[in-house]
Structure formats: structure tokens, C-alpha cells
């Protein structure tokens, strides 16, 4: 069985790599155009040139292609507290990050809010923070793990999971009462 | 299939409040992060907030920060929106939608609700 191709697929999949078929002519095959640049004209026949021009500012492409637009350039989003790590250039997009001791939470595929990692406060490190992962903290006796933070068993009510956690503190408790009541 | 049914909206006072709610079936909720983006009349879509599936990283717009607060019931897979110190530019249809997470294609949202009109008049 031959695999479903899209029409440009298909029109490309005719021409040798690094050549597209003319959409008006299908006996031809146009070179595409190097990154940074896009098609302007098709090549206007055999083993002739095709028109590429420079991406304006503002736009890129990052790949050979044959678009009749090059793509408009991403703007990092602030609201997100997303800092730009490297300006678009004609050939490359914007590249978005997150400050120093951040990480970056994906609400989306496409889209992440940077987050201050987690400092671990009454705990150690279990595993570092990482470009999109925060800190993983195992917390000291006495604590318990909430929301990646380690806050106290005094804070730990029945109907919470941390009982189990808290357990070992809270018999200890009893214990000292206990051996104190003779 | 995948539902989200808002309810909640309505008619309010400047300075009043409203707690939106939306109940989600057809999907696996406690395991998605969740968002609630407004249309007001005329105007493009805005997002308003979004939660992560356990309820502990949010995300909002600057122009409701402080005032309204988005949470989660994963045990009755529902999504909530509490808006307090409402304003007139508050005035919307709020949805609640799904935060794609695979499969995007440049979307950020895979599944929306019809919406709940929220009017802010005195």
C-alpha cells in the first residue's frame, strides 16, 4: 500500500531533494530557497534560478523552502516572566527562556510560565532544579512534602495524606507522654 | 467525549462578586491543566487563568491578579473561577477550556464550554 501524501508532499516527492515541482509547470523542478530566505518567483524554467529573496526584519525561515512568506518572528512572553535568551535573526526565531534559579512549567505544547525552583527550606535537594523540571526536595524528619514545599507536622491534619508521613512524629509524641505518666 | 459545562454567570454589581464553575466529563480531568479565557463583546479572546492538574502552579492575566482566584475539586472534576472586586471591563463570556498537551499544532487549547455570560452593570 502507498502512504496518503498531501498534494505539496506529493508535488514535492517528483523533484530530487532540495527541489520543489512548479506549481504551474509540473515538468519542472525549481530550487528551493536557502533558509533566510523566501520564494519571491518560481524559477521560470529548467536549470534556471528561482527568485529568493532576504526575510525582512522582523520575519524568518529556518529551513530550504518554498513559501511565498517568510514567518513572523516570536515575542517572548512577559506576562509569562519569559526573558529572551537570543533575538530572531533571518534564519533562526526567537529564542525564549527563564531567568537563573527558574524553571519553565508547560501549560501547553507551545507555551510555559517560568517559576521560581523550589529552595527546598527544611529539606535537601533529591534532584536539582532543570530547565523544565523544579527541584525535587525530600524533607527532613519532622516535615512533610506540600505543593514542593517542606512545611511542618504541626500543620498536619488527619485528613490530609501527610499522616502517613507524620506518623513516626506523632507516636513519638504519644511515647514522651506516656513514659512521663508512672 | 469530552464536556465542559460552565454555569455561574450573571448579572452583578461593580464591586460584587461571582464564583464561576465548570463540570468537565469525558477525559481523565485530575490529569490535565485547565484554563478559563473571556470574549468581551466586540473584543478578541483573553486569558483569564489557568491551573495545573493538582491545583498548585497558576497563571494569571495582570488585569484580574488579586482579585479573582482559579481552583480545582479533582474528586468532582470541576474547575472553578472566584471573582471578587468585579469591574465593568469584566464584562464577558467566560469559557473554560482544556490546555492541550500533545498534538498542539500551535493551538494552546483542545476543548472549550459554550460559555457564561458575566455582566458587570450597576
Known amino acids: 500500500l502507498v502512504p496518503h501524501l498531501g498534494d505539496r508532499e506529493k508535488r514535492d516527492s517528483v523533484c530530487p531533494q532540495g527541489k520543489y515541482i512548479h506549481p504551474q509547470n509540473n515538468s519542472i523542478c525549481c530550487t528551493k530557497c536557502h533558509k533566510g530566505t523566501y520564494l519571491y518567483n518560481d524559477c521560470p524554467g529548467p536549470g534556471q534560478d528561482t527568485d529568493c529573496r532576504e526575510c525582512e526584519s522582523g520575519s524568518f525561515t529556518a529551513s530550504e523552502n518554498h513559501l511565498r512568506h517568510c514567518l513572523s518572528c516570536s515575542k517572548c512572553r512577559k506576562e509569562m516572566g519569559q526573558v529572551e535568551i537570543s533575538s530572531c535573526t533571518v534564519d533562526r526565531d526567537t529564542v525564549c527562556g527563564c531567568r537563573k534559579n527558574q524553571y519553565r512549567h508547560y501549560w501547553s505544547e507551545n507555551l510555559f510560565q517560568c517559576f521560581n525552583c523550589s529552595l527546598c527550606l527544611n529539606g535537601t535537594v533529591h534532584l536539582s532544579c532543570q530547565e523544565k523540571q523544579n527541584t525535587v526536595c525530600t524533607c527532613h524528619a519532622g516535615f512533610f512534602l506540600r505543593e514542593n514545599e517542606c512545611v511542618s507536622c504541626s500543620n498536619c491534619k488527619k485528613s490530609l495524606e501527610c499522616t502517613k508521613l507524620c506518623l513516626p512524629q506523632i507516636e513519638n509524641v504519644k511515647g514522651t507522654e506516656d513514659s512521663g505518666t508512672t | 467525549e469530552v464536556q465542559l459545562l460552565e454555569s455561574g454567570g450573571g448579572l452583578v454589581q461593580p464591586g460584587g462578586s461571582l464564583r464561576l464553575s465548570c463540570a468537565a466529563s469525558?477525559?481523565?480531568?485530575?490529569?490535565?491543566?485547565m484554563a478559563w479565557v473571556r470574549q468581551a463583546p466586540g473584543k478578541g479572546l483573553e486569558w483569564v487563568s489557568f491551573?495545573?492538574?493538582?491545583?498548585?502552579?497558576?497563571y494569571y492575566a495582570d488585569s484580574v491578579k488579586g482579585r479573582f482566584t482559579i481552583s480545582r475539586d479533582n474528586s468532582k472534576n470541576t474547575l472553578y473561577l472566584q471573582m471578587n472586586s468585579l469591574r465593568a471591563e469584566d464584562t464577558a463570556v467566560y469559557y473554560c477550556?482544556?490546555?492541550?498537551?500533545?498534538?498542539?499544532?500551535?493551538?494552546?487549547?483542545?476543548?472549550w464550554g459554550q460559555g457564561t455570560l458575566v455582566t458587570v452593570s450597576s
Open positions: 477550556a482544556k490546555l492541550c498537551s500533545s498534538n498542539c499544532n500551535m493551538r494552546n487549547f483542545d476543548y
Open positions: 491551573i495545573d492538574s493538582e491545583g498548585v502552579l497558576t
Open positions: 469525558g477525559f481523565t480531568f485530575g490529569g490535565y491543566r
